[in-house]
């Protein structure tokens, strides 16, 4: 005969464990139901009554099956240098990531605690290593024969144009200037860009108009200009 299915609460067989989505209550000494994500235990089980679950209160969440007495508080609203890539719901915490042009200087378990602006390489310097979601731009001086005339977190050093007759020789921050006769070889006009890290935007559309100039409390304060490293500018 098949074993009878026990309904919570029930006393487990000696040496056995409770089933999936159940927990052992030390006080009642019974296997009791866990609460589903988005809920918490309002009333713990007894020998005769199962766990009573309730929905998480506003701005709190539980992500897992649980028997916690209170849901966890969602993180602070994202600061102005961040985008909300996951909204606070009953089942998930808010996740803030850095907006384009910024990188995460101090990460947390999910998302970013503190964003900082990507370093901009000043004229005479180009991007040696582009910024990522978690690392800053690295600048390098433009080697002989190359230049960068921009202050940018994406522009690399570009080769000088080659002139038949040079009017003004190029340097690290300026292209060569040719005499009216056209150069034999010229780079395509316009700066060469490196791809910027892209922050993934949330699929969740929140009805609130998110204040665009609202730095959040807690640790989510926007960082000021980064101290200029060699060949970089803090602007």
């Amino acid at each position: 005969l098949p074993a009878q299915v026990a309904f919570t609460p029930y006393a487990p067989e000696p040496g056995s464990t409770c089933r999936l989505r159940e927990y052992y209550d030390q006080t009642a000494q019974m296997c009791c139901s866990k609460c589903s994500p988005g809920q918490h235990a309002k009333v713990f089980c007894t020998k005769t009554s199962d766990t009573v679950c309730d929905s998480c209160e506003d701005s709190t969440y539980t992500q897992l099956w649980n028997w916690v007495p209170e849901c966890l508080s969602c993180g602070s609203r994202c600061s102005s240098d961040q985008v909300e890539t996951q909204a606070c719901t009953r089942e998930q915490n808010r996740i803030c990531t850095c907006r384009p042009g910024w990188y995460c200087a101090l990460s947390k378990q999910e998302g970013c605690r503190l964003c900082a602006p990507l370093r901009k390489c000043r004229p005479g310097f180009g991007v040696a290593r582009p910024g990522t979601e978690t690392s800053d731009v690295v600048c390098k001086p433009c080697a002989p024969g190359t230049f960068s005339n921009t202050t940018s977190s994406t522009d690399i050093c570009r080769p000088h144009q080659i002139c038949n007759v040079v009017a003004i020789p190029g340097n690290a921050s300026m292209d060569a200037v040719c005499t009216s006769t056209s150069p034999t070889r010229s780079m395509a006009p316009g700066a060469v860009h490196l791809p910027q890290p892209v922050s993934t935007r949330s699929q969740h559309t929140q009805p609130t108009p998110e204040p665009s100039t609202a730095p959040s409390t807690s640790f989510l304060l926007p960082m000021g200009p980064s101290p200029p490293a060699e060949g970089s500018t803090g602007d």
Epitope: T89, P207, T208, T217
Partner: antibody
């Protein structure tokens, strides 16, 4: 754009009931709460209660325990607040306001208010 | 219930003055759950500062908020004619959610 439009002014006798409506537009009623707040003439703001329009779950100040009923009609995006056993001290402007889930109760949009006068 | 007490209840100030309004809670309130509203006569309240120190879009940067625990402050760095109004603090930390009695900022 987000709008909360409330029903018109009411004059009621003591002991009667009043039902105020608040029609929401410009946003999804999911993941928001609708609150009711009142303001007696020349007085401050007093929170009455709130409803989750998606589930109908309500919470209110215990002082209104037996007199307030909050309901929602998701088909018309309208919430209602009914106050019974009216007395003269219930004379006030009644506001509906919304707070998105996860915004720690910040009420970012308010209705224009409904004046309820209780007079014999 | 958490009682919210604002001081002063009213104040008279001139354009350009620095104005500070305080809000004291009868028990501790998490900073995320403390908000301020501005209300002008005949109008509905407007969310003015959320989560203690954050300004919704459209609120001038001369407004700031600070505080923690039981003591919170709204400051106007340089009072402007359009700032004359009543300001309410509001806690959403524990139900029933409560408002301060309001601080009326009047022209001197």
């Amino acid at each position: 754009q987000v709008q909360l439009v409330q029903s018109g002014a009411e004059v009621k006798k003591p002991g009667a009931s009043v039902k105020v409506s608040c029609k929401a537009s410009g946003f999804n009623n999911k993941d928001i709460y609708m609150h009711w707040v009142r303001q007696a003439p020349g007085q401050g703001l007093e929170w009455i209660g709130r409803i989750d329009p998606a589930t109908g779950n309500t919470k209110h100040d215990p002082k209104f325990q037996d007199r307030v009923t909050m309901t929602s009609d998701t088909s018309t995006n309208t919430v209602y607040m009914e106050l019974s056993s009216l007395r003269s001290e219930d004379t006030a402007v009644y506001y509906c306001a919304r707070s998105p889930y996860g915004d720690f109760g910040a009420m970012d949009y308010w209705g224009q208010g409904t004046l309820v006068t209780v007079s014999s | 219930d958490i009682q919210m007490t604002q001081s002063p209840s009213s104040l008279s100030a001139s354009v350009g003055d620095r104005v500070t309004i305080t809000c004291t809670a009868s028990s501790s309130v998490s900073s995320n759950y403390l908000h301020w509203y501005q209300q002008k006569p005949g109008s509905s309240p407007k969310l003015w500062i959320y989560s203690t120190s954050n300004l919704p879009s459209g609120v001038p940067s001369r407004f700031s908020g600070s505080g923690s625990g039981t003591d919170f402050t709204l400051t106007i760095s340089s009072l402007q004619p359009e700032d004359f109004a009543t300001y309410y603090c509001h806690q959403y930390h524990r139900s029933p959610w409560t408002f301060g009695q309001g601080t009326k900022v009047e022209i001197k």
